[in-house]
């Protein structure tokens, strides 16, 4: 299962950290994507480690652990995040997160 | 300012052991994964080995597995690479260098050290 | 393991000049999770250890004059440097993020009349 903070706020020019965790007594992580709406940030897989995608790459820091570090925010980063585990075996978990970013 | 200072090279024979050591500073070291890449004299790169930050989980050039051990303390911030078994094919400048968090790449690179293997 | 060529493997120019190297990829460097060539270029000046200056096929890393410009996607790369200055003679590598072993090219040796 996948368990994360639903909705998270944080301020204009700061920064916040996206997380979800995952919990399995038998299945292994093989990649975790992390998407703004349709938009990747980045991805981590077991051969390739993390890749932040160029668009985001001044301003996303990959970490804590399978999260993310999202610098710089602006009012326009407000909206949903997801974050998608890919597992073997157990297939796909899916996580939500909604960010609110407030005016400082 | 990153640092990355390797040591431990120096002249051996052939059939016998050595271990680097890489001394990191200026950054979180136990965020990072970290490399050994080498450079025979006057040619090019040859990646060795590396030791992912969280999992430590590791991976070997064909050419050295099962002879070259990778580990690391982050507690001392510190990268190792034993070497046994040592071939004269192993000459080379062995280089630590840094992946960076968001790309799989070398960002940052030790001096180097220098391993001589000759009977 | 994926094999990278270098071409030329050593050119000469003059101060001002316009240079162009190229890397090729016995496999596709493109990586469809993150939509970008897992290609990097790199600068190693005599005596000195390498230095990143290209990731992502075409950007800068940081520090990076803008005279350094990376392109190509697939298999076929290149690296131009266009108003050569003396401090850019050297070796350049290019290397592959798409598979482990992560693998270089044989180097182009940039040499200033």
């Known amino acids: 299962t996948i368990d994360t903070k639903r909705n998270i706020s944080a301020e204009e020019g700061g920064s916040v950290i996206l997380q979800c965790h995952f919990s399995s007594d038998t299945a292994e992580v093989t990649q975790v994507d992390w998407k703004q709406q349709d938009q990747l940030l980045a991805i981590y897989s077991v051969d390739l480690g993390w890749h932040v995608a160029s668009v985001f790459s001044d301003r996303v820091v990959p970490g804590p652990s399978l999260g993310l570090t999202f610098q710089s925010l602006t009012m326009n980063d407000t909206g949903e995040y997801f974050c998608t585990y890919h597992t073997y075996p157990g297939g796909i978990y899916k996580g939500r997160i909604f960010l609110k970013v407030q005016e400082s | 300012e990153v640092q990355l200072v390797e040591s431990g090279g120096g002249l051996t024979q052939p059939g016998k052991s050595l271990k680097l050591s890489c001394e990191a500073s200026g950054f979180t070291f136990s965020s990072f994964t970290m490399h050994w890449v080498r450079q025979s004299p006057g040619k090019g790169l040859e990646w060795v080995a590396f030791?992912?930050?969280?999992?430590?989980?590791?991976f070997y050039a064909d050419a050295v597995r099962g002879r070259f051990t990778i580990s690391r303390d982050n507690a001392k911030n510190l990268l190792f690479l034993q070497m046994n078994d040592l071939k004269s094919e192993d000459t080379a400048m062995y280089y630590c260098?840094?992946?960076?968090?968001?790309?799989?790449?070398?960002?940052?690179w030790g001096q180097g050290t220098l391993v001589t293997v000759s009977s | 393991d994926i094999v990278m060529t270098q071409s030329p493997s050593s050119l000469a120019v003059s101060p001002g000049e316009k240079v162009t190297m190229t890397c090729k990829s016995s496999q596709s460097l493109y990586y469809s999770g993150v939509k970008e060539n897992l290609l990097a270029w790199y600068q190693q000046k005599p005596g000195q250890s390498p230095k990143l200056l290209i990731y992502?096929?075409?950007i800068r890393f940081t520090g990076v004059p803008d005279r350094f410009t990376g392109s190509g996607s697939g298999t076929d790369y290149t690296l131009t440097i266009t108003s050569v200055q003396a401090e850019d003679m050297g070796q350049y590598f290019c290397?592959?993020?798409?598979?482990?072993?992560?693998?270089f090219g044989d180097g182009t040796k940039l040499e200033i009349k």
């Open positions: 030791i992912r930050s969280g999992s430590g989980i590791v």
């Open positions: 260098a840094r992946r960076p968090l968001g790309h799989n790449t070398f960002d940052s």
């Open positions: 992502y096929a075409s």
């Open positions: 290397q592959q993020g798409i598979n482990n072993p992560l693998t």
